[in-house]
Interface confidence: medium
């Protein structure tokens, strides 16, 4: 199916930028992996690069405004022609749910005091209003609450006095037309306009003031223009060459408003001076290689020794990574394919341990399933041996850092009947539903 093709994908907002045009296939649009596409206008924007997870959205508002609730956030698998980590197809949403608390307490209403006395009438003649007030302190509201109703009320009042009306000018009438519209004739034409003292007229009893100034004004018609000439388009120029060497580009034709040139205030040519067309090089753009994440460290060993575990003997270990996705003469991955470090092996070593403090509360799981809960743990943490943190392997090569490697067997005193992990669980409250934000916008 044809798609809308764009030249940029904005990672921060997930939006397509720089519309190239429509009516092209996903495959042709994605000849350039920097491009992006939409299946329909306003639809989900997918970048042409290999799929990977978007940034997490901001946390949604807490599901309740006071006391403890829950909130969701999501991320989306975006990209084309592949899958995100976890073998997830592009377009798929992944959710996280956590507990939240915007305000510890909930608002409580207050009560009004009695009404105060009426204030004087707002005017000295004709009719106005008077006001009285009351206070929200009987009792005072708590935790951001308020009192129901209004803190003041007003009523009409009559001074029994008639007000005078002062005169004011209505707006000026239109200028009378000049005798000629372009390039003045034998007489200099004049134009006149007038106004009335009627907005409003001054009152008789009690007497109002008359309008100040004159009721009419006159001026000469000066600088009448020469008669205008409308502009006309010249022919379209040649089509510019395709500006890209791979994927889709945009060519342009131009024309000039000179057939004739507009003169003496005549209108410029209507329409566009340029028009564009999509051009297709039919050459796929280079795709640079990208490093996979590092593999696991190999076991910590020392040549010619069967085992160095639980001993103050430094060994070596390595890890590797793979350069994936390089196509069509793209750049190879920069950097090393293998990483080597020095290590002490504490694999399966019995070590004295101590209980950690409680961890922070984890995310609510499952985020979109029934009855989500959150958990925190205390772990039996091993106390690492005080081996030297650096070693000098070869004369003249300087000191090398040494890392502990392996999964030891920590020993702690029993805590709540447990030897390694103590876990506490709690239900998540006021859980909102998981809804695709793209579908909510429609």
């Amino acid at each position: 199916d044809p798609v809308l093709c764009f030249t940029q994908y904005e990672e921060s907002s997930g939006k397509c930028k720089g519309l190239l045009g429509g009516g092209v296939s996903v495959e042709d649009c994605c000849l350039n992996t920097a491009f992006a596409y939409q299946k329909r206008s306003g639809g989900l924007c997918q970048p042409c690069r290999s799929p990977r997870w978007s940034l997490w959205s901001t946390w949604a508002p807490c599901s309740v405004t006071c006391s403890e609730g829950s909130q969701l956030r999501y991320r989306r698998c975006v990209g084309w022609n592949g899958q995100c980590s976890g073998k997830v197809a592009p377009g798929t949403l992944e959710w996280q749910l956590q507990a939240c608390e915007d305000q510890q307490c909930c608002p409580e209403m207050g009560g009004w005091s009695g009404w105060g006395p009426w204030e004087p009438c707002s005017v000295t003649c004709s009719k106005g209003t008077r006001t009285r007030r009351r206070a929200c302190n009987h009792p005072a509201p708590k935790c951001g609450g308020h009192c129901p109703g209004q803190a003041q009320e007003s009523e009409a009042c009559d001074t029994q006095q008639v007000c005078p009306t002062h005169g004011a000018w209505a707006t000026w009438g239109p200028w009378t037309p000049c005798s000629a519209s372009c390039h003045g004739g034998p007489h200099e034409p004049k134009e006149t306009r007038s106004r009335k003292c009627s907005a409003p007229e001054p009152s008789q009893k009690p007497p109002g003031k008359p309008c100040p100034g004159l009721a009419y004004e006159q001026r000469r018609c000066t600088g009448l223009p020469p008669c205008p000439v409308a502009g006309g388009w010249g022919p379209w120029g040649p089509v510019s060459p395709c500006p890209v060497t791979c994927g889709l580009g945009q060519t342009m034709e131009q024309r000039t408003c000179n057939h004739p040139v507009p003169q003496h205030g005549g209108p410029f040519c209507a329409g566009d001076a340029t028009r564009t067309h999509i051009c297709n090089t039919a050459v796929p753009c280079p795709v640079d290689g990208e490093w996979d994440s590092w593999g696991e460290w190999s076991p910590c060993i020392r040549r010619n020794m069967k085992s160095i575990s639980c001993q103050e003997i430094p060994g070596q270990q390595s890890r590797g990574r793979t350069c994936r996705g390089r196509k069509f003469d793209g750049h190879r991955c920069a950097g090393q394919q293998q990483d080597i470090r020095h290590c002490y092996s504490i694999q399966h070593c019995p070590l004295k341990g101590s209980w950690s403090e409680w961890s922070t509360w984890g995310l609510c799981m499952p985020p979109c399933g029934p009855n989500p809960t959150r958990a925190r743990q205390r772990l039996c943490t091993p106390l690492l041996p005080k081996y030297p943190p650096t070693v000098s392997m070869v004369e003249g090569q300087g000191e090398k850092n040494v890392t502990f490697w392996g999964r030891p067997l920590p020993r702690c005193e029993e805590l709540q009947g447990q030897k390694l992990v103590v876990e506490e669980k709690r239900p998540c409250l006021h859980v909102p539903a998981c809804k695709d934000p793209e579908e909510e916008e429609l």
Partner: nanobody
């Protein structure tokens, strides 16, 4: 049984032309994307050109764009590669292949035809 049989290779001088053919059988040729892939001596395979099932879209490697033209005749179940302005670096065994040219996942290959460009 799927078969792809290439022909039309040979020895040609720099600047010369050749037309390669690939006869297909054993699958629905008219609904398959097809490619030409070449392998020079001592090097890995290099994608050259591709064409979609109805012949409406064609694609070329930057190194051959403007010199090579891919085409197909679905009535004859045959794929073609017209090669003009040949250079010594075009010397290779040329294979026709069926599959996804973009991800380089090819399901079927021919046995290849040798093209040698030499003065």
């Amino acid at each position: 049984e799927v078969q792809l049989v290439e022909s039309g290779g040979g020895l040609v001088q720099p600047g010369g032309s050749l037309r390669l053919s690939c006869a297909a059988s054993g699958f629905t040729f008219g609904s398959a994307d097809m490619s030409w892939v070449r392998q020079a001596p001592g090097k890995g395979p290099e994608w050259v050109s591709a064409i979609n099932s109805n012949g409406g879209s064609t694609y070329y490697a930057a190194s051959v764009k403007g010199r090579f033209t891919i085409s197909r005749d679905n009535a004859k179940n045959t794929l073609y590669l017209q090669m003009n302005s040949l250079k010594p670096e075009d010397t290779a065994v040329y294979y026709c292949a069926q599959g996804n040219w973009y991800t380089e996942e090819y399901h079927y290959w021919g046995q290849g035809t040798q093209v040698t460009v030499s003065g």
